[in-house]
Interface confidence: low
């Protein structure tokens, strides 16, 4: 019964890019400018997303698909469908509420986005530090201290005071 009823529904014949116009005897009318319908049988068309301000248009709106936005240079997308633009920082920095700040000692960020992360603790894997970490780069772990030739030294970085993203104590 349900299937029969849907087959008799004139709106089910309206393709994407149109809407079933109740004001015009349920005929299929094209979506007005700046609107779209991505599926058939719709009774209204959705308003196109506008990429304004820090957003820029990656894909124009058509009668069958919404516009897609990305971010202007110096910003990157966050959230599903680029719902937000967040400021880029330099490598070795993280974004704070007051702008970009250098990573604290013992942490690094090798990207233009995201937070500073603690250097790897080589000693947890029984290894030594081959190359010291910087604000932009993690430490490079080498062979275990026992494997080092006599006279070679290793540097173990201190753990940062509080690691980013820690849950409250």
């Amino acid at each position: 019964f349900e299937r029969t009823r849907s087959l008799q529904d004139p709106c089910s014949n309206c393709p994407a890019g149109t809407f079933c116009d109740n004001n015009r005897n349920q005929i299929c009318s094209p979506c007005p400018p700046n609107s779209f319908s991505s599926a058939g049988g719709q009774r209204t068309c959705d308003i196109c997303r506008q990429c304004k301000g820090v957003f820029r248009t990656r894909k124009e709106c058509s009668s069958t698909s919404n516009a897609e936005c990305d971010c202007t240079p110096g910003f990157h997308c966050l959230g599903a469908g680029c719902s937000m633009c967040e400021q880029d920082c330099k490598q070795g920095q993280e974004l704070t509420k007051k702008g970009c700040k250098d990573c604290c000692f013992g942490t690094f960020n090798d990207q233009k986005r995201g937070i500073c992360r603690p250097w790897t603790n080589c000693s947890l894997d029984g290894k030594s530090v081959l190359v010291n970490g910087t604000k932009e780069r993690d430490v490079v772990c080498g062979p275990s201290p026992a494997d080092l030739s006599p006279g070679a030294s290793s540097v173990t970085p201190p753990a940062p005071a509080r690691e980013p993203g820690h849950s409250p104590q």
Partner: antibody
Framework: EVQLVESGGGLVQPGGSLRLSCAAS??????????VGWIRQAPGKGLEWLAL???????SYSTSLKSRLTISRDNSKNTLYLQLNSLRAEDTAVYYC???????????????WGQGTLVTVSS | DIQLTQSPSSLSASVGDRVTITCRAS??????LAWYQQKPGKAPKLLIY???NRATGIPSRFSGSGSGTDFTLTISSLQPEDFATYYC????????FGQGTKVEIK
């Protein structure tokens, strides 16, 4: 154990000023990543964030109260302060100090709160 | 400034009920939302941070969800000690709180 204890509340005349203190223990206000702030609550009303200061001294203020607020700290006493000028009846509230619980720097919550100090502005 | 709107403003429920409180942000705040519980005469207590992470010592009956502009706090089975006022708070751009939701005994 982290503790925050506010003081300095009481009865203040309209047009006057107040200086609240918040003594912190169990952590240092100057440790990297630490930030502490002030939040108030008028009687029977909701919470309103006022100001915050970072470990490196950076300050943030509520847009609507910025011109009347000053947040500061004394690292040697591990104490936070809030000065509020040109007081009005609507500034009557319990004033809380609280510690930020995140060092992820965008996206912060308050994990430890003081017990609050009541400020009454009345003639 | 980012505004947070909580709904409902108050609700009456019984012990054992499932309670849902919503918080809507005036603009996208990713997952940078926290929930607090406050009892009369006491300071607020952190329940949930980053939209869905329970703070230390918070019972599993409290859960949070959402991202962008719409967030939910759920108490799966209301206990006598849960009657209180609940606030959401965003930390995406400065800090703002919702107006609160009072959970009362039916």
């Amino acid at each position: 154990e982290v503790q925050l204890v506010e003081s300095g509340g009481g009865l203040v005349q309209p047009g006057g000023s107040l200086r609240l203190s918040c003594a912190a223990s169990g952590f240092s206000l100057s440790t990297g990543g630490v930030a502490v702030g002030w939040i108030r609550q008028a009687p029977g009303k909701g919470l309103e964030w006022l100001a915050l200061i970072d470990w490196d001294g950076d300050k943030s203020y509520s847009t609507s109260l910025k011109s009347r607020l000053t947040i500061s700290r004394d690292n040697s006493k591990n104490t936070l302060y809030l000065q509020l000028n040109s007081l009005r009846a609507e500034d009557t509230a319990v004033y809380y100090c609280a510690r930020e619980g995140s060092t992820a720097v965008v996206g912060d919550w308050f994990d430890y709160w003081g017990q609050g100090t009541l400020v009454t502005v009345s003639s | 400034d980012i505004q947070l709107t909580q709904s409902p403003s108050s609700l009456s429920a019984s012990v054992g009920d499932r309670v849902t409180i919503t918080c809507r942000a005036s603009q996208g705040i990713s997952r940078y939302l926290a929930w607090y519980q406050q009892k009369p005469g006491k300071a607020p207590k952190l329940l949930i941070y980053d939209a869905s992470n329970r703070a230390t010592g918070i019972p599993s009956r409290f859960s949070g969800s959402g991202s962008g502009t719409d967030f939910t706090l759920t108490i799966s089975s209301l206990q006598p000690e849960d009657f209180a006022t609940y606030y959401c708070q965003q930390g995406y751009s400065l800090w703002t709180f919702g107006q609160g939701t009072k959970v009362e005994i039916k």
